[in-house]
Amino acid sequence: FKVATPYSLYVCPEGQQVTLTCRLLGPVDKGHDVTFYKTWYRSSRGEVQTCSERRPIRNLTFQDLHLHHGGHQAANTSHDLAQRHGLESASDHHGQFSITMRNLTLLDSGLYCCLVVEIRHHHSEHRVHGAMELQVQTGKDAPSNCVVYPSSSQDSENIT
């Protein structure tokens, strides 16, 4: 399987909220001994590999933001801890999972990574990740709503 990032760049005004999204593509094993671990973190475009460094999102680590379930179940994170930080990560039945960040500030700008670990008990872990950039802007040049740029082209879409 692979992870797709529908949008590679999100440009948002301060105070707005944004939902960063990743999607699992390809065959997903739903066997008894296969489970999935999904999470989010901030990173940098490192020398070794993008997303290899794991930094907290608003002081929440990737452990705090993880989703854990079998291949066909929906899930969301512990609401209390995440929501106190204006965050919520969630996953649906169709392989899409996301993190929503409320009340954006300039400090939220940076590279965000989603990580999916397919755990084949008795065999191995298979990791895949996706990366996307968030730019939070302020002032007269800031958009009124988030503008997202698809990964496949440079066309932009307005998110209201």
């Epitope: 001994d33 070794v48 290899s52 452990q63 512990s78 670990v117 008990h121």
Partner: antibody, heavy 117, light 107 residues
Framework: QVQLQESGPGLVKPSETLSLTCTVS????????WSWIRKPPGKGLEWIGY???????NYNPSLKSRVTISVDTSKSQFSLKLSSVTAADTAVYYC???????????WGQGTMVTVSS | EIVLTQSPATLSLSPGERATLSCRAS??????LAWYQQKPGQAPRLLIY???NRATGIPARFSGSGSGTDFTLTISSLEPEDFAVYYC?????????FGGGTKVEIK
């Protein structure tokens, strides 16, 4: 802050079953892998196996025929049973939290188990 | 299973010196390698994950490098509390395996 505490007898007779329990406090046991590792005197660390929060288990092939790891989520505990022990099973036994695609990040302080008649 | 070989077995150094510890894998583990520190009577403590990322609260004098089969843990300037045994561990597949350890002792 998550903390782990091993408990169980410090002395087991040869051919008997070693039984240890790890109590998880300060956090949920309903995530991650919960692992057992041991360190025989004068030797290195050896991974015994884990139980995943979902109930799936995975054991070191070198010990698989003798190992059972179980979990009691209502008590926030997971347990190790090692049957038919010999003197070679004398070791400090550690329980640890293992996070997928990460590492063994939190360990218990360890409990010494001696196999002797 | 993947065998991890650590060298040297013992490293005798003085405080303030640089320590370089090696871990070699019998087959590629990509960068899925961790380093732990263990002091007598204590549990191992996670230092480095994914070959080069410091775990939370680990001082900057500890750094990891390498990928594939050859890895290095470097302690840039030894502090008195750094004298301990260091283990590498792979997690590219199960069973998880550890190296035999390198003891860093005071010269």
């Amino acid at each position: 802050q998550v903390q782990l505490q091993e408990s169980g007898p410090g002395l087991v007779k040869p051919s008997e079953t070693l039984s240890l329990t790890c109590t998880v406090s300060g956090g949920s046991i309903s995530s991650y892998y919960w692992s057992w590792i041991r360190k025989p005197p004068g030797k290195g660390l050896e991974w015994i196996g884990y139980i995943y929060y979902s109930g799936s288990t995975n054991y070191n092939p070198s010990l698989k025929s003798r190992v059972t790891i179980s979990v009691d989520t209502s008590k926030s505990q997971f347990s190790l049973k090692l049957s038919s022990v010999t003197a070679a099973d004398t070791a400090v036994y550690y329980c640890a939290r293992d996070i997928p695609a990460f590492a063994l990040d939190i360990w218990g302080q360890g409990t010494m188990v001696t196999v002797s008649s | 299973e993947i065998v991890l070989t650590q060298s040297p077995a013992t490293l005798s150094l003085s405080p303030g010196e640089r320590a370089t510890l090696s871990c070699r894998a019998s087959q590629s583990v990509s960068y899925y390698l961790a380093w732990y520190q263990q002091k007598p009577g204590q549990a191992p403590r996670l230092l480095i994950y994914d070959a080069f990322n410091r775990a939370t609260g680990i001082p900057a004098r500890f750094s990891g490098s390498g990928s594939g089969t050859d890895f290095t843990l470097t302690i840039s300037s030894l502090e008195p509390e750094d004298f301990a045994v260091y283990y590498c561990q792979q997690r590219i597949n199960w069973p998880l395996t550890f190296g035999g350890g390198t003891k860093v002792e005071i010269k």
